[in-house]
């Protein structure tokens, strides 16, 4: 199988991006993305640009960030197209007719491309020290870059299954990402974990007529809790259910409901879990001015999120149209979706070489999530 992506991330509009360190010619890189089920990535304006920059800034690849790295993207100037010195993309264009942001909202050119109207030319994204995007650079298509960026598109997503009593969670996304945490997952993602007593469990995100759901997931948690309480989707004891302000920060496990005191779970007659307290990461997103409580919260369809319209591939789109899903590692709330790519992403590299992303946001807890980039 493919070596796993060095890093991957997703935006709230439904596109996932993966970054790969591999010395390749442009054609081989484009083929690698297609074989993974995606396409060589466009890096247009706005959210797409921020998503790719966040991937780069998550840390250097092989070599430790001592030199500038060049990454293939879906940017080229076709034969018979001229260099246009006054255009932001200098006559180059993205190999996709997807609607994008303003071309003026793009990176600068590290070097001005050669003036020509005859030869086909490709372009790369140059990253200073492998992490800080410097801008575009013209490059002959048959030369080798240090890596490439792929993009994927999915129509429906699975929200992260709540662990309950599960441990050792591992996600395998369909485009070969291995991760310890994916907040939203495309169909084909497999989650494996251990329940109490080291019993292995595995569920897969599948798409159906309604949306996407976790196959073989009985109930709403991977592993049932032995007790009555869950906090942030994990089993908890009552003493751990109070937040910093003394509020009740847990929800009741299946078969229990919130007691009259508002701070404990009691046996439920109906057996339906009831949510309680404030600041609870619940399965129903909190209502906000921009995010009213939806009537149906799960499964998530990309075209339902935040009133966005779905990305529809053009009929003759030379780059495979691929889905966007919210960024790995954020909390499962709609407010997190809203902030996922507006928030500044900071990342550090763990000793094992995995990437830890941290989100500066007041709208959700910013628990660091590790992306495991080891091979299968």
């Amino acid at each position: 199988e493919h070596p796993t992506a060095d890093r991957a991330g997703c935006s709230a509009s439904g596109a996932c991006y993966s970054l790969h360190h591999a010395t390749m010619k442009r054609q081989a890189a484009e083929e690698a993305c297609i074989l993974r089920g995606g396409a060589l990535s466009t890096v247009r304006a706005g959210a797409e640009l921020r998503a790719v920059l966040a991937l780069l800034r998550a840390g250097p690849g092989p070599g430790g960030g001592s030199k500038d790295l060049l990454f293939w993207v879906a940017l080229e100037r076709r034969r018979s197209h001229c260099t246009l010195e006054n255009e932001p993309l200098r006559g180059f264009s993205w190999l996709s007719s997807d609607p994008g942001g303003l071309e003026s909202d793009t990176l600068q050119w590290v070097e001005e491309p050669q003036r020509s109207c005859t030869a086909r030319r490709c372009a790369v994204l140059q990253a200073t020290g492998g992490v800080e995007p410097a801008g575009w650079k013209e490059m002959r298509c048959h030369l080798r870059a240090n890596g490439y960026l792929c993009k994927y598109q999915f129509e429906v997503l699975c929200p992260a299954p709540r662990p309950g009593a599960a441990s050792n969670l591992s996600y395998r996304a369909p485009f070969q990402l291995h991760s310890a945490a994916l907040d939203f997952s495309p169909p084909g993602t497999e989650v494996s974990a251990l329940c109490r007593g080291q019993l292995p469990i595995s569920v897969t995100c599948i798409a159906d007529e309604i949306g996407a759901r976790w196959d073989k997931l009985s109930g709403d948690v991977l592993c049932p809790c032995p007790g009555r309480y869950l906090r942030a989707g994990k089993c908890a004891e009552l003493p751990n259910c109070l937040d910093d302000l003394g509020g009740f920060a847990c929800e009741c496990a299946t078969g229990f409901e919130l007691g009259k005191d508002g701070r404990s779970c009691v046996t439920s007659g109906e057996g339906q879990p009831t949510l309680g307290g404030t600041g609870v990461p619940t399965r129903r997103p909190p209502a906000t001015a921009t995010s009213p409580v939806p009537q149906r919260t799960w499964p998530i369809r990309v075209d339902e999120k935040l009133g966005e319209t779905p990305l529809v591939p053009e009929q003759d789109n030379s780059v495979t149209s691929i889905p966007e899903i919210p960024r790995w590692g954020s909390q499962s709330t709609m407010s997190t979706l809203q902030m996922s790519l507006q928030a500044e992403s900071k990342a550090t590299i763990t000793p094992s070489g995995s990437v830890i992303s941290k989100f500066n946001s007041t709208t959700s807890s910013a628990t660091p999530q590790a992306f495991d980039s080891s091979s299968a």
Epitope: M24, K25, E30, A32, I34, P313, D316, S318
Partner: antibody
Framework: EVQLQQSGTVLARPGASVKMSCKAS????????MHWVKQRPGQGLEWIGA????????SYNQKFKGKAKLTAVTSTSTAYMELSSLTNEDSAVFYC????????????WGQGTSVTVSS | QIVLTQSPAIMSASLGERVTMTCTAS???????LHWYQQKPGSSPKLWIY???NLASGVPARFSGSGSGTSYSLTISSMEAEDAATYYC?????????FGGGTKLEIK
């Protein structure tokens, strides 16, 4: 001149495994994906999978996962495909093929390796 | 996966006759990634037309290709004896790569 030279005809028993080779010349072996295609007698073409010799990246058609295993040896510019647990359905001609600048069309093909599975 | 359906499966044409065969995709395919191959009995397939309309090296000018989206075609303006073969369309817009079932062209 680009050439892909494949190993010869194979006769195998059901349940056995076979490994065929494809020796490349005339281009930089490590810079291009090598694909494998199956053609049963009198039938059409099926893509099996591909390998990128530069880093041993592989990609398989879901239908052939567990059936075919692709490898490459860069020192000899040779790609290999191993087929396991052979059945009559595996009787076919297998081609190695790679693109070379024509928008991902498979524009160089080996002569094919014929595999016959019979008890 | 994208299914490519070729029609007709078998056709015969007289020498000098104009011939058209079609390839229909189950979902939209970029014209850049739709190709045609010619195969004769006992031989490997040969790239014949790439990216919908570009003739591969050595292919006679009487061949042409066109189409977009889900509908593509290969046309021979004037059939010659050497054109008798099976023609396959092939897409690489989405993985896995897929081929059509082929159109066998015979001389009438």
């Amino acid at each position: 001149e680009v050439q892909l030279q494949q190993s010869g005809t194979v006769l195998a028993r059901p349940g056995a495994s076979v490994k065929m080779s494809c020796k490349a010349s005339g281009y930089t072996f490590t810079s291009y994906w090598m694909h494998w295609v199956k053609q049963r007698p009198g039938q059409g073409l099926e893509w099996i999978g591909a390998i990128y010799p530069g880093n041993s990246d592989t990609s398989y058609n879901q239908k052939f996962k567990g059936k075919a295993k692709l490898t490459a040896v860069t020192s000899t510019s040779t790609a290999y495909m191993e087929l396991s647990s052979l059945t009559n359905e595996d009787s076919a001609v297998f081609y190695c093929t790679h693109y070379y600048g024509s928008d991902y069309a498979m524009d160089y093909w080996g002569q094919g390796t014929s595999v016959t599975v019979s008890s | 996966q994208i299914v490519l359906t070729q029609s007709p499966a078998i056709m015969s044409a007289s020498l000098g006759e104009r011939v058209t065969m079609t390839c229909t995709a189950s979902s939209s395919v970029s014209s850049s990634y739709l190709h045609w191959y010619q195969q004769k009995p006992g031989s490997s397939p040969k790239l014949w037309i790439y990216s919908t309309s570009n003739l591969a090296s050595g292919v006679p000018a009487r061949f042409s290709g066109s189409g977009s989206g889900t509908s593509y075609s290969l046309t021979i303006s004037s059939m010659e004896a050497e054109d008798a073969a099976t023609y396959y369309c092939h897409q690489y817009h989405r993985s896995p790569r897929t081929f059509g079932g082929g159109t066998k062209l015979e001389i009438k």
